[in-house]
Structure formats: structure tokens, C-alpha cells
Interface confidence: low
């Protein structure tokens, strides 16, 4: 057979081949970082020619291009600099608002050597919509300029880029786009390990908080997993063995499947594990209908003796088929359980496609997508029960739109990535769950089921019980310390008789704690100010209690997350490098905030937080309250930046005994706690017996109800003090 | 093609400081990393930091923490070395290299600057 | 913090394959470069990720890395491969060199 010509080297670059200079050989270019080769890659044909995939003209020099990354196409409410057409490696484009308009996202962005851009999408937003202002990213249009509840945006690529993520986003109820945000990529663009690590792990996690993770015995020897029947996860892995996968990378991709499975099997989660390989044919090598998928020694076993050989008869790309064998596998599962049973409908499903190109026969892949959608009833309710990813590996043939097709859309997560090799996949593997900090204690998990219990449904409530009868709240931040108000212990610092009374699903009364030690604000006077004519003080109303015994966590019990901290950073499936003003401006984003807390009685009640100048007029009230403050001058004295200020409207008050309690808000199904029930001006218990009665403040009283909180944004550099080395802290 | 030129050779007292320049040509100077590697007499190689030439962020081995200070000029292409608080065991010849952080290696070095330092 | 360790030298005849070795601690999880560097001159990269070569370098310069050892192999050495060689990874954001090995091209 003839041998294709070696006249094929790249200027600047290096060049490897499949199978030498015989036909079938695939050559593949590589530049140094920075650089991109152009053609990417050439296939020895058996005529004994070189042919490039996709060219239309005879064969061209190759050659090393520089990388460069796309330009803002428009850029709402504010300007950008430098306009260029495209920006280098190592290039910078800034971003300022216009007046009244705050600033989301990185301020000044760096073009990165894979021709992506670093930090995140800037947004100039006035917070005026039901949905924040999506954004456009840099390379997109835009069409749709309203972020109404039902509101739908479009967006499209310029020029020749790709774009991954959703191309149109709907605002929802909840105040969230729908999908995931679009990024307009150039077509040689790949992604770094250490942005496909947290973006994997981050999504991953989520999934994995989702499906119960509960507590579970382990053998001492060997790592067999005890099945119960709470969530359930199955996990399919498909690994191509196409003919353009080297031995070598299968072997890569064999091993990051077994870190994978090694990873997810030491969650505290129920987990089947079905092998697929595939070339022209898939061949099912583990299936999650074998009981030995719930077994990780068994799993790897199986895993080990996938042979790169299986497919040496047929070495197309048929991820049609591979995907359908998914679909089969769900569909005799679902007869097995029968379509109707909890058992069936309650299974999450994760599939994995590692695959090194695009697919070549047997149909759209997207089908099998369809299929297995429609089987596993995937609607905006049950969004959560399938997480497809698409993980392109080498440059070469990767086609980044059926990677986005085939990637789960879910806000704020990305499920479609190309890497640049396989040993960029293996870190990828290595590094996306760091198991250690994430099981039992996953914080901000409630249950939100309509039939689940008030402490189901917010688990990091406790109650404080100290010497007096006036009891006070307080939130679980880790399975030891809760976070409350100082003011419940300005009678004395013995805490001896103390207790605080932690969920127990044992017990609809919880279970009592002593407390080992008591960390009470040294800032905090509540007479402070008395000289001033301000007869009570709340500057600086926090404490923390170290309990004396670790809580078990269980679904009446699990800290909440506090934002700033890495834990939060997951569950509000953020970027490794965010900062704690990157949870308050997500968190904290518009004027006007919903946000709840605890009342006596268990129930969760609806507030609003009001920022920027609705803060002001919130707070200005307190100048009408002469009986607490008789010659008052500014409001400031009394109600500081430290905090929030809820109470307009129809807003619930706190109670006196509600105070220490959790003010917390909901994002991507987690719960964060963004302050602390401070004091108010209006009391909705007083002189009522029942702790389930509640009376609303008449519409004429002067000076209306106004209620202050702990803005835990503002309390930093003292909860890091002492919470350092229980919480991991992001930078301010 | 690509050229490294690095300031000449330097004679410092303990505890002075020196500064070592290098003008990069040939290439786009901002889609690089610079590199600062120093090789004591007889020693091995011993990495010192990095600048990015695009906006002059750096990153310092801990070793040098303290003491070294890392600057480009772009209108000029030439990056610079400072170390101060001079040592005799900071007796050396240094390498400023071009490259990128992470896997691809520093694939030009400049011709290296040997600074004595000695009472 | 991290180390690779390097044999102090080789020697063999021309001819020969020479093999240096550079261990670290899951080093194979992390890509490695080497670099030539001959008496009174700047060091030349020889190998990057693993085992791609620089333009210019010739053929018989490879590299691999799995487990905690790279090696660095040169066949049908010649006396002008006659240098020290350095491997180099990265550990966070900190470059590591290990100690180098003096490759001596006997006769």
C-alpha cells in the first residue's frame, strides 16, 4: 500500500502520527501554547494523499497562528477598552458602568493562552428586572431586552465563532435564567484543566447533594457499600475506542474513569456505575442493572479489563449508539421497577461521554439525547434527575457544537468541555471532587417536599434556651458551632444552664446541647450609646456557640452554608477563584431582596431586604421612634452598615424570642444565610399566648414596622477570627 | 528570530541591591511569560519568578519572597530583576527565559548575567 | 515543599542509549520538561510535556513520565550530547528543578 509523502512539517510546531505514513494514519498538529496549528490535523488517505479534514483547496502549509480571543460585539449600559477586533494572548479589556448602574462580573479581563477569557461575564445591571440582566458575553449578540418573569433572550456568535452553552434563556418564577450561559468560543479554543476541575466538581457536587447523602456504614475491610433505599445515583461512563484514540490515551481514559468511580463511591450516596465503550459498536461492560454496579472493586474490575482491542473490527465514532445503549439499560431498569414507583422516578442519572471526536455514523447523537430525556420524564421540575457531559479530548476533531448538544443546560454549571489531551483529562479526574470536605456536612440542604417537617425543611434552625424564660434562634454553620445574636446573653457569661435544642428526627423535640463555650462579641454594648440619647445599641449582635458534643447530621439537622466560604462557593456553583464580594453582589443583587426566617412556630416567613437606596428609606423610620431614641439626629447612630433592614410592605416581622435566628435566602436550591434576626420596631407577639398567632402591625401606626438584621458580609474579619479552621474562607 | 539580551555582568557589595535587564525581540512580547532562573557556580538551575509582560503581575518563588521585585517596560520589551539585601551565597548567573506557566517549558533564555557579589 | 531527584551522572559510550531519570512525588500527574545545558552556556529545552521536542531538537531525544519517575532517553548518543540535563515540573504555581545529572559520552 502506498505511503503518504513526509513533506508535512509545521513552522513553529511538531506534528505526531497515529499509525506512521501508512494509510488511515491520522498526523496531528501541535503549536506551543499561545499558538494554535493551522490545519489542525491530516488524514493519510489510501490513495497515499494527505487530506484535510474539512479543507476545500489542495493541501496548504500548516503552520502555528496566534491564538487570539473574540471582542465584546456590544457591551449594555457602559463602555469597554481597547476596541479591537480580536485581542492577543495576554491582552486586557476593561469595563466601567454608567451612572446608576452597578458593575456584575470581572471589572478587567485577560485573554488566555487557549483563546478563552479569563474571570466572568461584566454586566452593568440596575436591578430592575424580575431576572438580573443576563449579560452578553464577549462574541455574542443579543436579541431580547426584557427580564420580565416569561421573558425569553436569543443570543448568536459573530464571524465564525462557536457557541456553547444555551442560545436562548427564559427568566423563570424563581428569578433565575433558564439554561446555562452562552459563551461564543473561537473553534480552536480548548479548556485548562483547572477551569474544568471546579466547573466539573462544582456541578457534580450539586448533583451529589441532591441525591441524600446519608450516612452510611462502612465494612472494615474492602469498601463494600451498604445500599439503602433514600437517592439513588447511576452513573454511565462512555469511553471511545474509536480507531483515532491511541492505545496509549484509552489507557488515560480508563484510568480518570477509575478516578472518577473511586471519587464518587467515597460520597455517602447510593451509586450504580455502568462501563460502556464504543467505536462503531458500543459494548456494555458493566451494566447498572448487574448488582455488581453497586460494588466499586467490582466496577474498577471491570473497567481494568476493558481491552483496547474489543473494537479493532470496527473503529468509526458511533456515539449514537453508545448513548442509545443508555437508553436501553433506562428502559429495562424502568421495567424492572415499574414506571410508576418512587424506586424508578426517584434515580438521578449521570452519563460521562469521554470521546476524542465527533461522531461519523449511525445517526445524530442528539436522538438518543431526546430518548433518554423523554424515558427519565426530564421537564423543568425533574431537571435535576440527568446531568449529560460532553468531554471533547485533543483538538484535532472535536466538534464543539455536538459536545454543547449533547451537554446538560443547567445555570450556572457547564457540562461541555474540550481538553487538550488526555493527561489534561486525567488532572481533570483528579481534582473535580475533593470528597473530604463535601460529604455528611454539605451545608445549605433543605428539604423542600411539601410534605416535609418546618425543620426538615430548614435543619440549621436551633433554639437557645438560657437562664431566663426568653428563649433566642440560632443557625448550625458546621456540625459544632451555631451562629446567633449576642444580645440573648447580656445577662452574665455563665452559660453552664444553657442549651440549645438541635433538630432530631428521632424526636419532635429535638435534642438538647450543652454548650462548651461561648464567643460573644466584645463590640457589643447595647448601652453603648445611652449618652448620645440612644437608649439601645445593636451595633455588632453576634455571638457563636461551640456545642459541646459534635450533631450527628441528618436531614432534621445540616449546617447552612455561609456565603464566603468555599463551602458556599460550591453549592452556589461558582468559579475556584471567587471572592466573598462575589457572594454578596449574587447574592445581594437587587434593591429589593426576598429573603425568610424562622418564626416560633417553625414556619418559614417571607421578608425583603432592601439595598442600596431603598436601604436608606427603609432605615430612615427609625427617626419617627422617639420612646427608644428621644432626640435622635441621624438615623446612621442607630441603624449602621452593619446592617440589613427588612419591614416594608408585606413584609413578616420577627418576634422577640426570634432573635439570633437565621435570615437566609434560597439560590440554585441551597440555602445561604446573608444576616441574623437583630431588633425591630414593632413586636408581632406581644400579648399573645399563642405562639402561632401573630399580629400584624394597622397600617397607621407611626413609626411603621422596620426590623434590623446582622449583615454577615459586614462581620468578616470576626467570624474569620473564629471560625478559620472550621469553614474555609475565600478571599475578601 | 527570538533574541534575549541580557545586561552585562556586576560586581555588588553585601547587602547592596542589582538590577538585571532583559530586552526581548522578535516576537510579541505580551503573549509570553518571562521567566527569572538563577545557577549558582557549579550548582544547578533555580527558579526565581515569573512576570506577565501583558500587565506586569507577578509571582515569586518563596525563597525570594522578600527580596526580589519583578518589572517590565512594554514600550521597551525588556522585563527586570531586582534583588536587594545582596548576600555572597547570592553570587550568580542569572537567566531571565522566555515561556509559558505551566507545561511548555522556557523555550528561549537569554544569555545570562553573572553578579558577584563579595566585600 | 517539592522535589525531584536526579542521579548526579551517567556515563556510557557513543552509541548507546542513555536514560536520565528525575522522580517526584505522582509526578506522572504532573507534565515535565527537560533542558540541556553545556559548560558556559544557557540552558536548552529539550523535551516539554513529557515527551514533545521542540523544534530543532533532534529525534533521538524522548521523554516520559507515569508514576513518580520521568525519564528523559537519548539514542545513539553522541559526544555532543555530552551536557548537564535538568528536568523541571510545575508544583502549584512554583517551577521545581531537579538537581541535574552530568551525561558523560565515554572515549
Known amino acids: 500500500a502506498p505511503s503518504c509523502p513526509q513533506n508535512v512539517n509545521i513552522s513553529g510546531g511538531t506534528f505526531t502520527l497515529s499509525h506512521g505514513w501508512a494509510p488511515g494514519s491520522l498526523l496531528t498538529y501541535s503549536c506551543p501554547q499561545g499558538l494554535y496549528p493551522s490545519p489542525a490535523s491530516r488524514l493519510c488517505k489510501s490513495s497515499g494523499q494527505w487530506q484535510t479534514p474539512g479543507a476545500t483547496r489542495s493541501l496548504s502549509k500548516a503552520v502555528c497562528k496566534p491564538v487570539r480571543c473574540p471582542a465584546p460585539v456590544s457591551f449594555e449600559n457602559g463602555i469597554y477598552t481597547p476596541r479591537l477586533g480580536s485581542y492577543p494572548v495576554g491582552g486586557n479589556v476593561s469595563f466601567e458602568c454608567e451612572d446608576g448602574f452597578i458593575l456584575r462580573g470581572s471589572p478587567v479581563r485577560q485573554c488566555r493562552p487557549n483563546g478563552m477569557w479569563d474571570g466572568e461575564t461584566a454586566v452593568c445591571d440596575n436591578g430592575a428586572g424580575h431576572c438580573p440582566n443576563p449579560g452578553i458575553s464577549l462574541g455574542a449578540v443579543r436579541t431580547g431586552f426584557r427580564f420580565g418573569h416569561g421573558d425569553k433572550v436569543r443570543y448568536r456568535c459573530s464571524s465564525n465563532l462557536v457557541l456553547t452553552g444555551s442560545s436562548e434563556r427564559e427568566c423563570q418564577g424563581n428569578g433565575v435564567w433558564s439554561g446555562t450561559e452562552p459563551i461564543c468560543r473561537q473553534p480552536y479554543s480548548y479548556d485548562f484543566p483547572e477551569d474544568v476541575a471546579p466547573a466539573l466538581g462544582t456541578s457534580f457536587s450539586h448533583m451529589l447533594g441532591a441525591t441524600n447523602p446519608t450516612q452510611k456504614t462502612k465494612e472494615s475491610l474492602g469498601r463494600k457499600i451498604q445500599i439503602q433505599r433514600s437517592g439513588h445515583l447511576n452513573l454511565y461512563l462512555l469511553l471511545d475506542c474509536s480507531q483515532s484514540v491511541s492505545e496509549n490515551d484509552f489507557l488515560i481514559f480508563k484510568e480518570s474513569a477509575s478516578l472518577m468511580v473511586d471519587r464518587i463511591f467515597s460520597f455517602e450516596i447510593n451509586v450504580s456505575v455502568a462501563i460502556i465503550t464504543f467505536a462503531s459498536e458500543p459494548k456494555v461492560l458493566m451494566s447498572v442493572l448487574n448488582d455488581n454496579s453497586r460494588d466499586m472493586t467490582e466496577v474498577i474490575s471491570s473497567l481494568e479489563n476493558a481491552n483496547y482491542k474489543d473494537h479493532e473490527n470496527g473503529t468509526g465514532t458511533n456515539t449514537y449508539a453508545a448513548l442509545n445503549s443508555v437508553y436501553l439499560m433506562m428502559n429495562n431498569q424502568m421495567r424492572l421497577l415499574g414506571m410508576e414507583t418512587m424506586a424508578w422516578q426517584e434515580i438521578r442519572h449521570a452519563i460521562i461521554l469521554l470521546t476524542d471526536g465527533k461522531s461519523n455514523m449511525g445517526g445524530s447523537p442528539k436522538t438518543a439525547v431526546d430518548h433518554i430525556r423523554e424515558i427519565l420524564n426530564i421537564n423543568q421540575k425533574r431537571n435535576d434527575y440527568l446531568d449529560i457531559y460532553a468531554i471533547g479530548v485533543g483538538k484535532l476533531d472535536v466538534d464543539w457544537r455536538e459536545l454543547n448538544e449533547l451537554g446538560s443546560k443547567k445555570d450556572g454549571e457547564r457540562h461541555a468541555f474540550i481538553l487538550q489531551d488526555t493527561k489534561a483529562l486525567h488532572q481533570v479526574f483528579e481534582h473535580m471532587l475533593d470528597v473530604s470536605k463535601l460529604t455528611d456536612t454539605i451545608c445549605g440542604v433543605g428539604n423542600m417536599s411539601a410534605n416535609a417537617s418546618d425543620q426538615e425543611r430548614t435543619p440549621w434552625h436551633v433554639t437557645i434556651k438560657p437562664k431566663s424564660q426568653e428563649t433566642c434562634r440560632g443557625a448550625l454553620i458546621s456540625d459544632q458551632w451555631v451562629l446567633t445574636a449576642a444580645h440573648c446573653f447580656r445577662d452574665g457569661n455563665d452559660h453552664s444552664l444553657w442549651r440549645v435544642n438541635v433538630g432530631d428526627p428521632k424526636s419532635q423535640w429535638g435534642k438538647e446541647f450543652l454548650i462548651e463555650k461561648a464567643v460573644i462579641s466584645p463590640g457589643f454594648d447595647v448601652f453603648a450609646k445611652k449618652n448620645q440619647g440612644i437608649l439601645e445599641f445593636y451595633g455588632d449582635d453576634i455571638a457563636l456557640l461551640k456545642l459541646a458534643q459534635k450533631v450527628k447530621m441528618s436531614t432534621h439537622a445540616r449546617p447552612i452554608c455561609l456565603p464566603c466560604t468555599m463551602e458556599a462557593n460550591l453549592a452556589l456553583r461558582r468559579p475556584q477563584g471567587s471572592t466573598c464580594r462575589d457572594h454578596e453582589n449574587e447574592l445581594l443583587n437587587k434593591q429589593s431582596v426576598p429573603a425568610h426566617f424562622v418564626a416560633l412556630n417553625g414556619s418559614k416567613l417571607n421578608i425583603n431586604l432592601k439595598m442600596g437606596v431603598e436601604w436608606t428609606s427603609c432605615a430612615e423610620v427609625v427617626s419617627q421612634e422617639k420612646t427608644m431614641f428621644p432626640n435622635l439626629t441621624d438615623v446612621r447612630e442607630v441603624v449602621t452598615d452593619q446592617f440589613l433592614c427588612s419591614g416594608t410592605q408585606e413584609d413578616e416581622s420577627p418576634c422577640k424570642g426570634e432573635s439570633g435566628g437565621a435570615v437566609f435566602l434560597e439560590r440554585r436550591f441551597r440555602f445561604f444565610q446573608v444576616g441574623l434576626v437583630s431588633w425591630g420596631l414593632y413586636n408581632p407577639c406581644l400579648g399573645s399566648a399563642d405562639k402561632n398567632s401573630r399580629k400584624r402591625a394597622p397600617r397607621s401606626k407611626v413609626p411603621p414596622p422596620r426590623d434590623f438584621h446582622i449583615n454577615l458580609f459586614r462581620m468578616q474579619p470576626w467570624l474569620r477570627q473564629h471560625l478559620g479552621d472550621v469553614l474555609n474562607f475565600l478571599p475578601l | 528570530q527570538v533574541q534575549l539580551v541580557q545586561s552585562g555582568a556586576e560586581v555588588k557589595k553585601p547587602g547592596a541591591s542589582v538590577k538585571v535587564s532583559c530586552k526581548a525581540s522578535?516576537?510579541?512580547?505580551?503573549?509570553?511569560?518571562m521567566y527569572w532562573v538563577r545557577q549558582a557556580p557549579g550548582q544547578g538551575l533555580e527558579w526565581m519568578g515569573i512576570?506577565?509582560?501583558?500587565?506586569?503581575?507577578?509571582t515569586y518563588a518563596q525563597k525570594f519572597q522578600d527580596r526580589v521585585t519583578m518589572t517590565r517596560d512594554a514600550s521597551t520589551t525588556t522585563v527586570y530583576m531586582e534583588l536587594s539585601s545582596l548576600r555572597s551565597e547570592d553570587t550568580a548567573v542569572y537567566y531571565c527565559?522566555?515561556?509559558?506557566?505551566?507545561?511548555?517549558?522556557?523555550?528561549?533564555w537569554g544569555q545570562g548575567t553573572l553578579v558577584t557579589v563579595s566585600s | 515543599s517539592y522535589e525531584l531527584t536526579q542521579p548526579p551522572s551517567v556515563s556510557l559510550s557513543p552509541g548507546q542509549t542513555a536514560s536520565i531519570t528525575c522522580s517526584g512525588d505522582?509526578?506522572?500527574?504532573?507534565?515535565t520538561c527537560w533542558y540541556q545545558q553545556k559548560p558556559g552556556q544557557s540552558p536548552v529545552l529539550v523535551i516539554y510535556?513529557?515527551?514533545k521536542r521542540p523544534s530543532g531538537i533532534p529525534e533521538r531525544f524522548s521523554g516520559s513520565n507515569s508514576g513518580n519517575t520521568a525519564t528523559l532517553t537519548i539514542s545513539g548518543t553522541q559526544a555532543m550530547d555530552e551536557a548537564d540535563y535538568y528536568c523541571?515540573?510545575?508544583?502549584?504555581?512554583?517551577?521545581?528543578f531537579g538537581g541535574g545529572t552530568k551525561l558523560t559520552v565515554l572515549g
Open positions: 527565559a522566555r515561556g509559558y506557566e505551566g507545561s511548555y517549558g522556557f523555550d528561549h
Open positions: 522578535g516576537y510579541s512580547f505580551t503573549t509570553y511569560y
Open positions: 512576570i506577565t509582560p501583558s500587565g506586569g503581575s507577578t
Open positions: 505522582k509526578l506522572g500527574n504532573k507534565y
Open positions: 510535556q513529557d515527551n
Open positions: 523541571q515540573t510545575w508544583d502549584s504555581s512554583t517551577a521545581v
